[in-house]
């Protein structure tokens, strides 16, 4: 299953399959997730080691048993790949690293006014993988405000150095934020020239394209079909690049197919997995296991659940079957692709779905009336779980926020439905940033069921929590994916990085905002909060957040929206925006429903509604 916990001061011994430099453990974990054989990783921050060569070292590891011995190493961080972790799988990495220079091939230098502008330039340059920016206080005046766009053979820095007044980060192309746009067309009977960066075997041009999209240096590809004249080259997928970023020439060639990486697509990237099953095809590779199962779909599920399995062949040969079950060959290779593809066989083959980010149809958990005042504009995909709950009577308007917690589930505040319990009047918009982008053609979800907490009473602040079951499940994308829930009764975790988001009022007597707002707010202890609200009972099932001096808070229109906190690189839904005295007033923190206290209720309702377990435990 999915394991998300990180091990501090621990280093996995042995099992190395690759190493690289990464700025932090989260980026190292992402590289492990996308590496075909990596199950475990260990990362050495600069503070953990004196050896300059090993600083920022990211070590990717494999293990036949799925685990490795841990040795104590001060400062080291280790953990698991996020294969099998559904919506948590993403190649998108937004963080900017201060005081760090990520080295690589510098191919473009320009003057810009901010690190955000530099990151934007990198994202909009086809060859840029990462960048460094010298701030206005950099010690050498001639380098100040320099934005260096970079690439490297592996897509990660060739070295990382601690350097004051330098900020570094990665291209946001994997976040589907590139302005370049992409070529969706694939071209039959056409071969591209230029430099081959890799060669893999694939059953079709679409798999070839997806592999190209997620390869750090592939910009375009040529695929040789299974009827290509040279038998040894059939099903070969050549991943390519060029200095210019486009093919310098193309040649008409029977039974070849060419196309482009989709990494520069805006708003939508292909999933990093291949779900099609290929009847009459055998995939060759290293044997991991052989098991008898009933049907090719069960074979694919078996492969997906066995984390080291990359692809499979289900044999229908009479000698491989007994009763209704046939042999399911679970296989792997060095590069994650079959080492041989044979056609016209009595088998059916396909790939593990371990990197599919749709995950299962569950709510995400982790094991172990109020808009934003004093906030700033959010950017695309920053808060992909945020939804807008709108009511359509004569006109249509935004009333509340909510959080996507599963394909078919939204968590919000019960008071949003005070006086409006009719599910037909509600429209739920997900994957949006600007309310003004909503037109009559914008897709929305309708409500199948509103589940208000049984102990909630109108005009009381207690148990202000409600679940919405959507009529149809939503697909996950970079802009629309769920937030993980905390573990039941989560009291031990100290959250220091918490944010509230919403389209609500920017001042007490304001109006709904167009762009989704965000504000960083510290949590306040319940004791402190109770002192500020002596006329109300602040219960253990509430959590408070706010600045003593006020100025930043949720407000009308944010109700039901998320209070999220980042811990160990992972966002969790800590609170649901509920109530407060005015907005952003001095010594009047916002009050939020404490999600951890309602985990039993959430799981009971999301499971019983479908009559099947919906629990996904990534840790």
């Amino acid at each position: 299953g999915c394991l998300t916990q990180l091990y501090e001061n621990a280093f996995f011994r042995g099992g190395d399959v690759a190493s690289m430099y990464t700025p932090n453990a989260q980026y190292c974990q992402m590289r492990c997730t996308f590496h075909p054989r990596c199950l475990l990783f260990s990362f050495l921050p600069a503070s953990s080691i004196n050896d300059m060569e090993k600083r920022f070292g990211c070590f990717l590891k494999d293990s036949v048993t799925g685990t490795l011995p841990k040795v104590h190493r001060t400062g080291a961080v280790s953990g698991h790949s996020l294969k099998q972790c559904g919506h948590q799988i993403s190649a998108c990495h937004r963080d900017i690293y201060k005081g760090v220079d990520m080295r690589g091939v510098n191919f473009n230098v320009s003057k810009v006014s901010s690190v955000e502008e530099c990151q934007k330039r990198c994202t909009s340059n086809i060859r840029c993988q990462f960048f460094s920016y010298a701030t206005q206080t950099f010690h050498k005046a001639e380098y100040r405000n320099n934005c260096l766009l970079k690439y490297s053979p592996g897509g990660t820095p060739t070295a990382i150095k601690v350097l004051s007044n330098v900020e570094s980060g990665f291209s946001l192309k994997p976040c589907a934020l590139s302005e370049i746009g992409c070529h969706m067309n694939i071209f039959q009977h056409l071969a591209f020239s230029d430099v081959d960066v890799a060669r893999v075997l694939t059953p079709d041009a679409f798999v070839c394209r997806t592999i190209c999209t997620y390869h750090p240096n592939c910009l375009f590809f040529t695929f040789y079909t299974n009827v290509w004249k040279i038998e040894s080259q059939r099903n070969v997928c050549l991943l390519k690049t060029s200095e210019s970023g486009t093919p310098s020439s193309s040649t008409p060639q029977e039974n070849t197919i060419s196309g482009y990486s989709l990494l520069t697509c805006k708003r939508t990237l292909p999933e990093p997995c291949h779900s099609k099953i290929y009847p009459g095809v055998d995939f060759g590779g290293e044997e991991l296991n052989v098991t008898f199962v009933k049907g090719v779909n069960v074979c694919q599920e078996t492969c997906t659940k066995m984390i080291r399995c990359q692809f499979f062949t289900y044999s229908l040969l009479p000698e491989d079957c007994k009763e209704e079950k046939c042999k399911c060959f679970l296989r792997l290779s060095m590069d994650g692709s079959p080492t041989r593809i044979a056609y016209g066989t009595q088998g059916s083959s396909g790939y593990s779905l371990r990197l599919c980010n749709t995950g299962d149809n569950s709510v995400c958990t982790t094991k172990t009336s109020t808009r934003i005042v004093g906030g700033t504009n959010s950017s695309w995909g920053e808060w992909p779980w945020q939804v807008s709950l709108q009511v359509k009577l004569t006109a249509q308007r935004h009333l509340c926020g909510g959080s996507l917690i599963g394909h078919q589930w939204v968590l919000t505040a019960a008071h949003c439905f005070d006086g409006l319990p009719l599910q037909d009047v509600w429209r739920i918009y997900s994957g949006i940033l600007n309310l003004s982008d909503i037109t009559k053609d914008t897709p929305f979800s309708q409500i199948k069921e509103i589940i208000i907490h049984q102990n909630y009473k109108v005009s009381e602040g207690n148990h202000d929590i409600a679940l919405i079951k959507l009529q149809a499940p939503l697909n996950y994308t970079e802009f629309q994916k769920p937030i993980c829930l905390p573990s039941k009764g989560d009291t031990s975790t100290i959250y220091t990085n918490c944010w509230v988001t919403g389209w609500g009022f920017s001042k007490e007597k304001g109006e709904i905002q167009n762009i989704l707002q965000k504000v960083n707010i510290p949590l306040v202890t319940n004791e402190e909060c109770q002192k500020r609200y002596q006329d109300y009972k602040i219960t253990q099932r509430m959590v408070c957040a706010g600045y003593k001096e006020g100025g930043k808070d949720a407000c009308k229109g944010d109700s039901g929206g998320p209070l999220v906190c980042k811990h160990n690189g992972m966002w969790r839904l800590v609170g649901i925006t509920s109530w407060g005295e005015g907005c952003a007033r001095r010594e009047q923190p916002g009050v939020y429903t404490k999600v951890a206290e309602y985990m039993d209720w959430i799981l009971e309702k999301t499971q019983s509604s479908d009559g099947k377990a919906q629990m996904q435990s990534p840790a």
């Epitope: 969706m184 067309n185 694939i186 039959q188 059953p203 079709d204 041009a205 679409f206 695929f223 079909t225 299974n226 009827v227 099903n235 039974n255 197919i257 292909p270 779900s275 099609k276 099953i277 009847p279 009459g280 229908l316 056609y343 016209g344 066989t345 009595q346 697909n475």
Partner: antibody, heavy 119, light 107 residues
Framework: EVQLLESGGGLVQPGGSLRLSCAAS????????MFWVRQAPGKGLEWVSS????????MYADSVKGRFTISRDNSKNTLYLQMNSLRAEDTAVYYC????????????WGQGTLVTVSS | DIQMTQSPSSLSASVGDRVTITCRAS??????LNWYQQKPGKAPKLLIY???SLQSGVPSRFSGSGSGTDFTLTISSLQPEDFTIYYC?????????FGQGTKLDIK
């Protein structure tokens, strides 16, 4: 030039049999997966059967399973559809089609042959 | 089997109009979606493959888009020869299935 030419259609009584042929030319027939697709009068397209380049595996629509048999003779560049126990609802124009490998579309179709099942 | 639902089943338009035909799959089919045009008494002709790639020789006024379950075929400026029947077809899993067709006729 790629060509597919169906033959063998005609009028047959319910319960009767018919064998359709599709002669292929202009390409290496033995490398391609081939299909039969039919279209009842005034209706849409319906996939009937498919066969791999080497002859196996074969697949059939539920509506024809157990009654129709697809086969091929790569030495003669010919695709066949043996139709037994014919029913009135099998009345249609039958097309043979070539699948373009690795992108899974029918790039070449025959002109079609009409099969009429009626007493 | 995967069901393919085309809408509308018939459509009236004029020469020069921009029209859109939609096709919905009963489950996700990635981009394994093709569009065909069929004229009376003729075999179908491929227009678009892989959801968005234009078959060689097909006029550029035809375009396709979509992935997952929802797809569209757009004809940017209708020509007299475009008034006929259009089918979508999924090639994600056997048996390949077709939509029921959309008949495009002159208003």
């Amino acid at each position: 030039e790629v060509q597919l030419l169906e033959s063998g259609g005609g009028l047959v009584q319910p319960g009767g049999s018919l064998r359709l042929s599709c002669a292929a030319s202009g390409f290496t027939f033995s490398l391609y997966r081939m299909f039969w697709v039919r279209q009842a009068p005034g209706k849409g397209l319906e996939w009937v059967s498919s066969i791999w380049s080497s002859g196996g595996p074969t697949m059939y629509a539920d509506s024809v399973k157990g009654r129709f048999t697809i086969s091929r003779d790569n030495s003669k560049n010919t695709l066949y559809l043996q139709m037994n126990s014919l029913r009135a609802e099998d009345t249609a124009v039958y097309y043979c089609a070539r699948e373009y490998p690795s992108t899974y579309y029918f790039d070449y179709w025959g002109q079609g042959t009409l099969v009429t099942v009626s007493s | 089997d995967i069901q393919m639902t085309q809408s509308p089943s018939s459509l009236s338009a004029s020469v020069g109009d921009r029209v859109t035909i939609t096709c919905r799959a009963s489950q996700s089919i990635s981009t394994y979606l093709n569009w065909y045009q069929q004229k009376p008494g003729k075999a179908p002709k491929l227009l678009i493959y892989g959801a968005s790639s234009l078959q060689s020789g097909v006029p550029s006024r035809f375009s396709g888009s979509g992935s997952g379950t929802d797809f569209t075929l757009t004809i940017s400026s209708l020509q007299p020869e475009d008034f006929t029947i259009y089918y979508c077809q999924q090639s994600y899993s056997d048996p390949y299935t077709f939509g029921q067709g959309t008949k495009l006729d002159i208003k």
